[in-house]
Interface confidence: medium
């Protein structure tokens, strides 16, 4: 059967005015997963997103992550979504005073 | 697929305010993005804004900035427009629509309610 | 603003003609993420708009494949290879690639 990620979106100062939102799946079975920002509800284009490789992550499911740079105060418009085994998700960059945000998609 | 049902027709008086409903069913609600989008009688169609029903996230045509505030409310799976300092000219039919950004798709306005109409007359 | 122009106003056919509208945009409509999202809607006297094209030439789930859609940069095209009945109405071009996402000023499609 199929082991549905765990996601994770996180963020860290960049530069002066950017911040570095990092979207991570983690404890997914099988490996194959979509994982990427959205801006206004519409992929970004590949040139700027970074990807983590799928790798194993010692429990028989697997990990990777996608994070982008964006303009801080902007955070509202961009999303990470995720597509693994037919189901799919959304999920929000969180807010500046809280740096997690995680939820177990079923 | 699901439904977008609008709320019922309205007559306001010119400065008055107006709050549109559009209640939605059958699909994911905080996963989606909503538009609301204008037509007067007779003429084309103008996207007004979106909102994001996941955290109320929004972006607006500058043109309704003004006019239009967007708001959401995930317990009851609704969504609402704000319009305010009505005149004449506001008056139209406003639909709120689904985007559809799964997959591959990538459609802006892929299911739409039925519209409600707005007349403002003194 | 990303202004719209489409051509004809109105289009006269007999059912079972191939129709063909335009659609103009003032600038090239692709978004910085590589994709053209030009899209095509119709809408029927009294009712909503309902999307039969995206991207440019992507039918929406439903629709039959005697709509096609086609071009790139800043012409594009929507054919209807047999027109019935039930395709006659008002037809817009929307570009959703530069904001405010904006649309064409619509083509109605009826009987000769």
């Known amino acids: 059967g199929s082991v549905p990620p765990m996601v994770n979106v996180t963020r860290s100062e960049a530069s002066e005015g950017n911040i570095t939102v990092t979207c991570r799946a983690s404890s997914f079975y099988p490996r194959n997963i979509t994982l990427t920002w959205r801006q206004d509800g519409v992929s970004l284009s590949h040139d700027t997103q970074q990807w983590g490789d799928v790798l194993p992550d010692g429990n028989g499911t697997y990990q990777t992550w996608v994070a982008t740079r964006i303009c801080q105060g902007e955070e509202q418009r961009f999303t990470c979504y995720m597509e693994h085994s037919g189901n799919h998700s959304t999920h929000p960059v969180p807010s500046g005073n809280s740096h997690h945000h995680h939820h177990h998609h079923h | 697929q699901g439904q977008m049902q609008q709320s019922g027709a309205e007559l306001v008086k010119p400065g008055a305010s107006v709050k549109l409903s559009c209640k939605t069913s059958?699909?994911?609600?905080?996963?989606?993005?909503i538009s609301w989008l204008k037509q007067k009688p007779g003429q084309s169609l103008e996207w007004i804004a979106w909102?994001?029903?996941?955290?109320?996230?929004?972006s607006y045509n500058q043109k309704f900035r003004d006019k239009a505030q967007l708001t959401v409310d995930t317990s009851s799976r609704t969504a609402y427009m704000q319009l305010s300092s009505l005149t004449t000219e506001d008056s139209a039919i406003y639909y709120c629509?689904?985007?559809?950004?799964?997959?591959?798709?990538?459609?802006?306005?892929?299911?739409w309610g039925r519209g409600t109409l707005v007349t403002v007359s003194a | 603003d990303v202004l719209m122009t489409q051509t004809p106003l109105s289009l006269p056919v007999s059912l079972g003609d191939q129709a063909s509208i335009s659609c103009r945009s003032s600038?090239?409509?692709?978004?910085?993420?590589?994709?053209?999202?030009l899209e095509w809607y119709l809408q029927k006297p009294g009712q909503s708009p309902k999307l039969l094209i995206y991207?440019?030439?992507n039918r929406f789930s439903g629709v039959p494949d005697r709509f096609s859609g086609s071009g790139s940069g800043t012409d594009f095209t929507l054919k209807i290879s047999r027109v019935e009945a039930e395709d006659l109405g008002v037809y817009y071009c929307f570009q959703g690639s530069h904001v405010p996402w904006t649309f064409g000023g619509g083509t109605k499609v009826e009987i000769k």
């Open positions: 629509a689904r985007h559809d950004y799964y997959g591959t798709s990538g459609a802006w306005f892929a299911y």
């Open positions: 600038q090239h409509i692709v978004h910085s993420n590589e994709n053209t999202y």
């Open positions: 059958g699909f994911t609600f905080s996963d989606n993005y």
């Open positions: 909102i994001y029903a996941g955290t109320g996230g929004s």
């Open positions: 991207k440019v030439s």
